[in-house]
Interface confidence: low
């Protein structure tokens, strides 16, 4: 799997899990949240060869005719594949409220 | 939706589906399908700013990093959301046999 | 495709209540983080800020209205309704809603706005 | 209340005009200043957030700077299609519209 514990051992240029953390208020703008002050949220990024953890059998078509069509601006793009939530406190007046937002943190990646 | 009634009726340099004809024999080098010669697969390509068609809460937040940060290599990407498959004609020796090959034609896109 | 659209009377009469319907499509007040707005344009003049209410209920109101103001939203029909008591000639103007993500304050897409004059 | 001062109130200029137009806040707001265009009978669009972010799908000779009390709205070279009004917002303590500057045809 492209997830942290093959992508962050490895130097690979290929599509693999990539480290990102985000300070809500400076990176985003948003104030309101209270805990925490930002969290990991990696990303996907790197070449999809063919074959290379290929979600569909779209993508592999997509990246074998990209091979052999090396010009064209069709080609399979690196994204995320697994995902998990993220807790947060916030306050509405001075009533703290928490809640789980969903799919905020990339765990793994795919080619698709 | 960002499907072929959207994205084929209107220029959008954003995440939309784009037309892709695949002949199986001259883009992929495959010689077995009999029919069909080839098929519209499609693809998906473009900009992913953001809230346009994002598919996560991670995606959203990422779409807002990048346009606060734009120098930064983290932004999402233009790929397949729906799928449909491709049923073809191929021979084992003189038999005919007919197939459903899974996940072959991109119908709509997303940005992910 | 994100759309709001603004519904209600077109002409009110003083001390009456102002009730306006805000009905949208392309995203859902259930998001998290999610928020709709209210803004008012009298005829010729500037924007004002009225109220705001947002996918957790939390609600805010303008300073110098808060006492004429209650937002709701009904997250089912992708509607949120405003309502403004005691109405006056100098609250005419066009009312339009908007959509607002994540807290962040700005508003990134508009209704088409609804004017609404007060007069006997 | 934060109060939001805009200047001019308006201004004439010429199309291929650099054109400056600046909001000041009461009190600090950090970068929490978002610019709107507003044309007659239309809906304002947002076209910059968070004091420098352009709004996706508007063109580069809009651009925003400033942070804390003083910012500026800058259109590089001004279109025919830029003549407008003008609005700058602050989001740091609930929300406050500028009153407006009006670009007009000189």
């Known amino acids: 799997a492209l997830d942290a514990a093959y992508c962050f051992r490895n130097v690979q240029d290929n599509c693999c899990l990539r480290p990102l953390y985000i300070d809500f208020k400076r990176d985003l703008g948003w104030k309101w949240i209270h805990e925490p002050k930002g969290y990991n949220a990696n990303f996907c990024a790197g070449a999809c060869p063919y074959l290379w953890s290929s979600d569909t059998q779209h993508t592999k078509v997509l990246s074998l005719y990209n091979t052999i069509n090396p010009e064209a601006s069709a080609s399979p793009c690196c994204v995320s594949q697994d995902l998990e939530p993220l807790t947060i406190l916030y306050y509405i007046g001075n009533t703290p409220k928490i809640e789980q937002l969903s799919n905020m943190i990339v765990k793994s990646c795919k080619c698709s | 939706a960002l499907d072929a009634a959207y994205c084929f009726r209107n220029v959008q340099d954003n995440c939309c589906l784009r037309p892709l004809y695949i002949d199986f024999k001259r883009d992929l080098g495959w010689k077995w399908i009999h029919e069909p010669k080839g098929y519209n697969a499609n693809f998906c390509a473009g900009a992913c700013p953001y809230l346009w068609s994002s598919d996560t809460q991670h995606t959203k937040v990422l779409s807002l990093y990048n346009t606060i940060n734009p120098e930064a290599s983290a932004s999402p990407c233009c790929v397949s959301q729906d799928l449909e498959p491709l049923t073809i004609l191929y021979y084992i020796g003189n038999t005919p046999k007919i197939e459903q090959l899974s996940n072959m034609i991109v119908k709509s896109c997303k940005c992910s | 495709q994100v759309t709001l659209r603004e519904s209600g009377p077109a002409l009110v009469k003083p001390t009456q209540t102002l009730t306006l319907t805000c009905t949208f499509s392309?995203?859902?007040?259930?998001?998290?983080?999610?928020?709709v707005g209210w803004i008012r344009q009298p005829p010729g003049k500037a924007l004002e800020w009225l109220a705001h209410?947002?996918?957790?209920?939390?609600?805010s109101y303008s300073t110098s209205l808060k006492t004429r103001l209650t937002i709701s939203k009904d997250t089912s029909k992708n509607q949120v309704v405003l309502t403004m008591t005691n109405m006056d000639p100098v609250d005419t103007a066009t009312y339009y809603c908007?959509?607002?993500?994540?807290?962040?304050?700005?508003?990134?897409?508009w209704g088409q706005g609804t004017l609404v004059t007060v007069s006997s | 209340d934060i109060q939001m001062t805009q200047s001019p109130s308006s201004l004439s200029a010429s199309v291929g005009d650099r054109v400056t137009i600046t909001c000041r806040a009461s009190q600090d707001i950090s970068n929490y200043l978002n610019w709107y265009q507003q044309k007659p009978g239309k809906a304002p669009k947002l076209l910059i957030f968070g004091a420098s972010s352009l709004q996706s799908g508007v063109p580069s000779r809009f651009s925003g700077s400033g942070s804390g009390t003083d910012f500026t709205l800058t259109i590089s070279s001004l279109q025919p299609e830029d003549f407008a009004t003008y609005y700058c917002q602050q989001t740091n303590t609930m929300n406050t519209f500028g009153q407006g500057t009006k670009v007009e045809i000189k």
């Open positions: 908007a959509r607002d993500f994540y807290y962040s304050g700005y508003f990134d897409s």
């Open positions: 209410i947002y996918w957790n209920d939390d609600k």
């Open positions: 392309g995203f859902s007040l259930s998001t998290s983080g999610m928020g």
